[in-house]
Interface confidence: low
Amino acid sequence: KSSNEATNITPKHNMKAFLDELKAENIKKFLYNFTQIPHLAGTEQNFQLAKQIQSQWKEFGLDSVELAHYDVLLSYPNKTHPNYISIINEDGNEIFNTSLFEPPPPGYENVSDIVPPFSAFSPQGMPEGDLVYVNYARTEDFFKLERDMKINCSGKIVIARYGKVFRGNKVKNAQLAGAKGVILYSDPADYFAPGVKSYPDGWNLPGGGVQRGNILNLNGAGDPLTPGYPANEYAYRRGIAEAVGLPSIPVHPIGYYDAQKLLEKMGGSAPPDSSWRGSLKVPYNVGPGFTGNFSTQKVKMHIHSTNEVTRIYNVIGTLRGAVEPDRYVILGGHRDSWVFGGIDPQSGAAVVHEIVRSFGTLKKEGWRPRRTILFASWDAEEFGLLGSTEWAEENSRLLQERGVAYINADSSIEGNYTLRVDCTPLMYSLVHNLTKELKSPDEGFEGKSLYESWTKKSPSPEFSGMPRISKLGSGNDFEVFFQRLGIASGRARYTKNWETNKFSGYPLYHSVYETYELVEKFYDPMFKYHLTVAQVRGGMVFELANSIVLPFDCRDYAVVLRKYADKIYSISMKHPQEMKTYSVSFDSLFSAVKNFTEIASKFSERLQDFDKSNPIVLRMMNDQLMFLERAFIDPLGLPDRPFYRHVIYAPSSHNKYAGESFPGIYDALFDIESKVDPSKAWGEVKRQIYVAAFTVQAAAETLSEVA
């Protein structure tokens, strides 16, 4: 049998058949079903949903569907001892207290088990002190405070606005600045789009709405008590003092009604510039402490949350490949939510469900994919990507030998303006070709391709006539697959217009107001954007699992490697004197990139010409493509971040959500002018250039002719 016959690719069972089977109405129905009650990780409700999904995936026709459970560290508020923040007077009396819960949205007043807003993994504590406003609590914000304004945060409670960077980075920065507590709040400048009403009348954040979220700094470790290994029945667990990534100071989130009460009284220094002002009617004084008559008042935090080892459940579905069953294409997204999960994650989970149904329909008609497809419903993503990481730790040997690609499927929408894709350069051509074949759902682009509307609305900053595709960072379940294991990964969703809406994420992110009605009334009433995202995610999985030659183009990696080398070189060249003094050269890196470019070009030529009917040669060429991403993995990992092992990409050390290129070199150069031992610092830059150059050269050689 030829490969074509084995996978039964007939006109009835091609990509079009798979895509045509995807229905917006089904996604809508699944979203409704997944969002009627909360599905917090570690709760009975989320276990029941796992079993429901297992049962339905079996009905849809998958070969097997199993639950994979782990016992991981989670964090919950104390039900009888709520968390809050108060303003206290000189006598210690609480003259103002923040709210204990969000006012529930209409229709949900009688729903039980809505977890109140909290910062997951905050330690317990009741610190009191003067407040310092630290803007977004980014690295540069603390530089401004400490270096330019000479404001000392030591022993202070800091208040920071959500947005721009991952909240865990904010807490880490505050800890390093010596703060004894952190208050996080949503400023309307970031979470209230002008001209749009608050929920339930629109998609904006009301004053009582609060963003939940974890504040860990795991750096890819997974369960804080079992870094590197699965949290299984015989796991050895670290003591809590040795746990990875836990914050050391109390942290609590509030909405802008409560934030107004705290910020309104702030005295001390004026904000350094307009970028420190939000849109509340307060002066945004930095502090420390309150002004004038209020200078004797202090802020006190009351945090009583507990960390508990709790069982979580992933759902893993398998559709066995007909020709290469030992090659895995994975589609995964999480199931756990903070409350109802109207967008995060169930808009993604509903799309995965429909993709599984469509694949199952084809399978029932006798079709199989060429390669095995694994479908995953991850648990405890919101608590630090725990479900996906533990499963990957348990299955790392299989994955590193057999993993072709991972496609992530969290929230399908964060807006309804245009497509947003982050992926490995290996997938650029796949994404371009696929979106050229899909219809755009956008108004004004009737009859046009998705590629066309996407390129028009989100043009590439480098290449005319092409859409923007971003680097992978982290903050989602692809992390372990890409950053630790080196499996080619990608993600796609519909997003907002970043030019006109400069708020962070979507306003109701991680609040009680993220409901089915939010999506159905305001974001995607026809579910046409969800359908498009299903087509993109599903289409990528279909091609990756079914194309005879893997749809990876190694030449696109060559292009970006040159771009990243130019960028890091120009950063280093801001210090020409030191580069001369310490003999810092990038020649080895540029030489390796040049070699990679030439070898990738020759490999692509061979890929066009080889005999695809020879299964051994086909498998050999495909393996070279599959293992290219793996070749960028350094087994020793990045400095102080052993689970971030990809030499070309890592989550930014200053913002987990963002990707950084040549992260080892970047971090070595960061703030190098302030290092106490410049010789040692520039020595580390040289070492990182060496590691990067070696890795690029080694990766290039995997594409050379094998003998």
Epitope: P188, A189, F192, G207, Y256, Y257, Q260, E264, K265, G267, R277, G278, S279, L280, K281, V282, P283, Y284, F290, T291, G292, N293, F294
Partner: nanobody, 126 residues
């Protein structure tokens, strides 16, 4: 809905003082900022000053700085403008404004969708 009623206006000689009051009634909970504006004949409405809910933040325009003081008594739901060393150019209709919006360009930002009083006339003349 919030109703604002200004009082205390009148005719006064240059160099003398006057105290304006603005009583707020109705749904006053959640009024975060109150302010004074004035409009002289043939001119645009001009910002005079504002005060935040607790009185901890006050802002007065440069043209009246050092002469006018803004204050607020929350127990009486009343805003005050103490005007000293009055000048002829202070002649105008003085309006009280209140905002329950938490967001704006600045904390003392007001616009037409906020609450406004009818105004009280202040004439400074010898």
């Amino acid at each position: 809905q919030v109703q604002l009623v200004e009082s205390g206006g009148g005719v006064v000689q240059p160099g003398r003082s006057l105290r304006l009051s603005c009583a707020a009634s109705g749904r006053t909970f959640g009024i975060y900022v109150m302010g004074w504006f004035r409009q002289a004949p043939g001119k645009e409405r001009e910002f005079v000053g504002a005060i935040s809910w607790s009185g901890s933040n006050r802002k007065v325009s440069d043209s009246v700085k050092g002469r006018f003081t803004i204050s607020r008594d929350n127990s009486k739901n009343t805003l005050y403008l103490q005007m000293n060393s009055l000048r002829a150019e202070d002649t105008a209709v003085y309006f009280c404004a209140a905002s329950n919006k938490l967001y704006g360009r600045t904390w003392y930002d007001f616009n037409e969708s906020d609450y406004w009083g009818q105004g009280t006339q202040v004439t400074v003349s010898s």
